[in-house]
Interface confidence: medium
């Protein structure tokens, strides 16, 4: 018979024959032959594989480093990775939760809408027209542009969401 060019689901093609993939939680030891099945072995204590696979090495479970403020939210199994979270009152810096911050800062151009609490992170909002923030801060709101008129000055440089207006003296018409 013709050697296969494609295999069924949960199989892979090798040496012109279809071998079974290893199930999640197991790694490949040896490919199947005409006479033997694929040989698989369970992953070790701190390892996992989460798909049907032909990997010869299992992946290491993620380490929740307490020096980065991390702790284990869900212990890994042979089929799943460990899930990390931050210590109480702290917040993940990304969806993958690779490190923690006490509370996020709002970048220049953004102000704090709500200061962080033990359970919620800082909420930032863009500074609207007429307001600015020139600092990265976990506390400061957007500040209103300086009103040059109230100081009997004129706007020399327009403000942005990151900078205040620059005021200057009015041009006096010479007689």
């Amino acid at each position: 018979p013709e050697p296969p060019t494609a295999c069924r689901e949960k199989q892979y093609l090798i040496n012109s024959q279809c071998c079974s993939l290893c199930q999640p939680g197991q790694k490949l030891v040896s490919d199947c032959t005409e006479f033997t099945e694929t040989e698989c072995l369970p992953c070790g204590e701190s390892e996992f594989l989460d798909t049907w696979n032909r990997e010869t090495h299992c992946h290491q479970h993620k380490y929740c480093d307490p020096n980065l403020g991390l702790r284990v939210q869900q212990k890994g199994t042979s089929e799943t990775d460990t899930i990390c979270t931050c210590e109480e009152g702290w917040h993940c810096t990304s969806e993958a939760c690779e490190s923690c911050v006490l509370h996020r800062s709002c970048s220049p151009g953004f102000g704090v809408k709500q200061i962080a609490t033990g359970v919620s992170d800082t909420i930032c909002e863009p500074c609207p027209v007429g307001f600015f923030s020139n600092v990265s801060s976990a506390f400061e709101k957007c500040h209103p542009w300086t009103s040059c008129e109230t100081k009997d000055l004129v706007v020399q440089q327009a403000g942005t969401n990151k900078t205040d207006v620059v005021c200057g003296p009015q041009d006096r018409l010479r007689a």
């Epitope: 020096n67 980065l68 006490l102 600092v135 990265s136 976990a138 506390f139």
Partner: nanobody, 116 residues
Amino acid sequence: EVQLLETGGGLVQPGGSLRLSCAASGFTFEWYEMQWVRRAPGKGLEWVSAISGDGYRTYYADSVKGRFTISRDNSKNTLYLQMDSLRAEDTAVYYCAKELGYFDYWGRGTLVTVTS
């Protein structure tokens, strides 16, 4: 490399005072908000206080408001925490932290013990 060194901790009686210092190096100190954070024995971390880069704006946790005062001297790259009317529940290791409080920008901490 960012380095933060806290000093000034010690043993004090309830109602007493202590002044903590944090010497900073490895970054432009005045550009950053700085924080004090503490960890009581067997408890999680608790944010205590923060101060803006220019030192004009200060922020406090409700548990220390009116008793603690945060300040900074940008010419000396140093952060301070004046702690008055100390209580037993203020016993903790106190850390200063740069800006966001990323764990990798922390000092080793200084232990404050309030006991009679």
